[in-house]
Interface confidence: medium
């Protein structure tokens, strides 16, 4: 297997819920602007999901900039960290299962899943990439686990992978999102894909530091950031080597297998804003 085909899988005891932003500007990267002042400000970091300090130059920049930690938290965080993952003992669905699907106001359409209370099943929809509501899941399995009724009227707990010995067929499996990593490569490899401000639709690649892979995105032709490569190879060469995933206890688990493209996108890919 080549470096490009290697996939790092980690098992952790924590899993981040999909990131849902209250305001799309919370997804902007910290921008100190062109001026040279040294002003302590706060911005929302989509990777750590926390408000953090940065130094602002005093002019220009963007809306992801707040005078105080409290103001930042008020604008960009919501108390969704304690989302309940249902177990077979809890029959109540979370309230958000009853919300209608909401694509939000952005245009970076990605495939997501929502619970349709009318059909009583999880369905696929196109999420615009920002705002929306919590009836929005990265995977069909996660949606089913949380919102669908199991065969006995209980909530489905989780799926295990089962290989049918007769026909080698697969049954659904729940997948975990890697949530802990260290990065020792160029800093721009950590920035989100940035489409830029123009109207072109160029095929480019950016490094997704959450999953340690290069992913395609559409570049507008101008603006954006340095996490923008014309080929997957160039992207991997620049960024892949610096990525190390760790278990919370400090050990590293690596499994090698062929890369498999899936329609399901990782939560952090929702943060770039297309044609807002």
């Amino acid at each position: 297997d080549s470096e490009e085909d290697e996939e790092h899988t980690i098992i952790t005891d924590t899993e981040l819920p999909p990131l849902k932003l209250m305001h799309s500007f919370c997804a902007f990267k910290a921008d100190d602007g062109p001026c040279k002042a040294i002003m302590k400000r706060f911005f929302f970091n989509i990777f750590t999901r926390q408000c953090e300090e940065f130094i602002y130059g005093g002019c220009e920049g963007n809306q992801n900039r707040f005078e105080s930690l409290e103001e930042c938290k008020k604008m960009c965080t919501r108390d969704n960290a304690n989302r309940i993952i249902k177990t077979t003992l809890q029959q109540e669905k979370p309230d958000f299962c009853f919300l209608e699907e909401d694509p939000g106001i952005c245009r970076g359409y990605i495939t997501r899943y929502f619970y349709n209370n009318q059909t009583k099943q999880c369905e696929r929809f196109k999420y615009g990439g920002c705002l929306g509501n919590m009836n929005n899941f990265e995977t069909l399995e996660e949606c089913k686990n949380i919102c669908e009724d199991g065969p006995n009227g209980f909530q489905v707990d989780n799926y295990g992978t089962q290989l049918n010995a007769v026909n080698n067929s697969l049954t659904p499996q729940s997948t975990k999102v890697p949530s802990l990593f260290e990065f020792h490569g160029p800093s721009w490899c950590l920035t989100p894909a940035d489409r830029g401000l123009c109207r072109a639709n160029e095929n480019r690649f950016y490094y997704n530091s959450v999953i340690g892979k290069c992913r395609p995105f559409k570049y507008s032709g101008c603006g954006g950031n340095e996490n923008n490569f014309t080929s997957k190879q160039e992207c991997l060469r620049a960024c892949k080597k610096g990525f190390i995933q760790r278990i919370s206890k400090g050990g590293l688990i690596k499994t090698k297998r062929k890369r498999k493209k899936q329609r399901v996108k990782i939560a952090y890919e929702e943060i770039f804003v297309k044609n807002m």
């Epitope: 359409y109 995977t139 997948t175």
Partner: antibody, heavy 119, light 107 residues
Framework: EVQLVESGGGLVQPGGSLRLSCAAS????????LDWVRQAPGKGLEWVGD????????LYNQKFKGRATISVDQAKNSAYLQMNSLRAEDTAVYYC????????????WGQGTLVTVSS | DIVMTQSHKFMSTSVGDRVSITCKAS??????VAWYQQKPGQSPRLLIY???TRHTGVPDRFTGCGSGTDYTLTISSVQAEDLALYYC?????????FGGGTKLEMK
């Protein structure tokens, strides 16, 4: 060259079952979902459901839920549609189609297999 | 379910004509619309996805446009081989639904 070949169609009694196969070739099977779409004679297209070949996760049109089961066999690069409790209105050409996630559309279709439900 | 309505079941045209086939969704489908061509005895063929992007190998006389609930497939200069059934499909949410089809025929 991408090819999808359906088989298993034919005459079925009302109340009976059928199992259709879709053999895929010419691409990496696990890179794309496979969808089933049907078309009644002289009518339009109707989406039945789809499957992710990597983990077997399925989505169904609610209209067919409970009667339709889509499965996959990675070793054979094949997907299957099992339909139970068939009635006359299930008479149709059943197509399997490759669902390309980057397009969010069905970019290659099989030639279809005709299922006739009649006594 | 989202209903896709193609108001014209048939459209008459001549070679060289410009023709526009319309499709209306029962709710906003956020440009998640595909167009398929189906010739007699054949399976459908993808022409356009995401409302306006041409699939590989599709001649540039085929263009798609639209947003919200209203979408159009235009053939700028109809060729004899374009006489077929045309279906719109929304891929915004499952169940994916198709329009009833518009048959393009010669005058």
């Amino acid at each position: 060259e991408v090819q999808l070949v359906e088989s298993g169609g034919g005459l079925v009694q009302p109340g009976g079952s059928l199992r259709l196969s879709c053999a895929a070739s010419g691409y990496t099977f696990t890179d794309y979902n496979l969808d089933w779409v049907r078309q009644a004679p002289g009518k339009g297209l109707e989406w039945v459901g789809d499957i992710n070949p990597i983990n077997g996760a399925t989505l169904y049109n609610q209209k067919f839920k409970g009667r339709a089961t889509i499965s996959v066999d990675q070793a054979k690069n094949s997907a299957y549609l099992q339909m139970n409790s068939l009635r006359a209105e299930d008479t149709a050409v059943y197509y399997c189609a490759r669902y390309y996630g980057d397009y969010d559309a069905m970019d290659y279709w099989g030639q279809g297999t005709l299922v006739t439900v009649s006594s | 379910d989202i209903v896709m309505t193609q108001s014209h079941k048939f459209m008459s045209t001549s070679v060289g004509d410009r023709v526009s086939i319309t499709c209306k969704a029962s709710q906003d489908v956020h440009t998640a619309v595909a167009w398929y061509q189906q010739k007699p005895g054949q399976s459908p063929r993808l022409l356009i996805y995401w409302a306006s992007t041409r699939h590989t190998g599709v001649p540039d006389r085929f263009t798609g446009c639209g947003s919200g609930t209203d979408y159009t497939l235009t053939i700028s200069s109809v060729q004899a081989e374009d006489l077929a059934l045309y279906y719109c499909q929304q891929h915004y949410t499952t169940p994916y639904t198709f329009g009833g089809g518009t048959k393009l025929e010669m005058k």
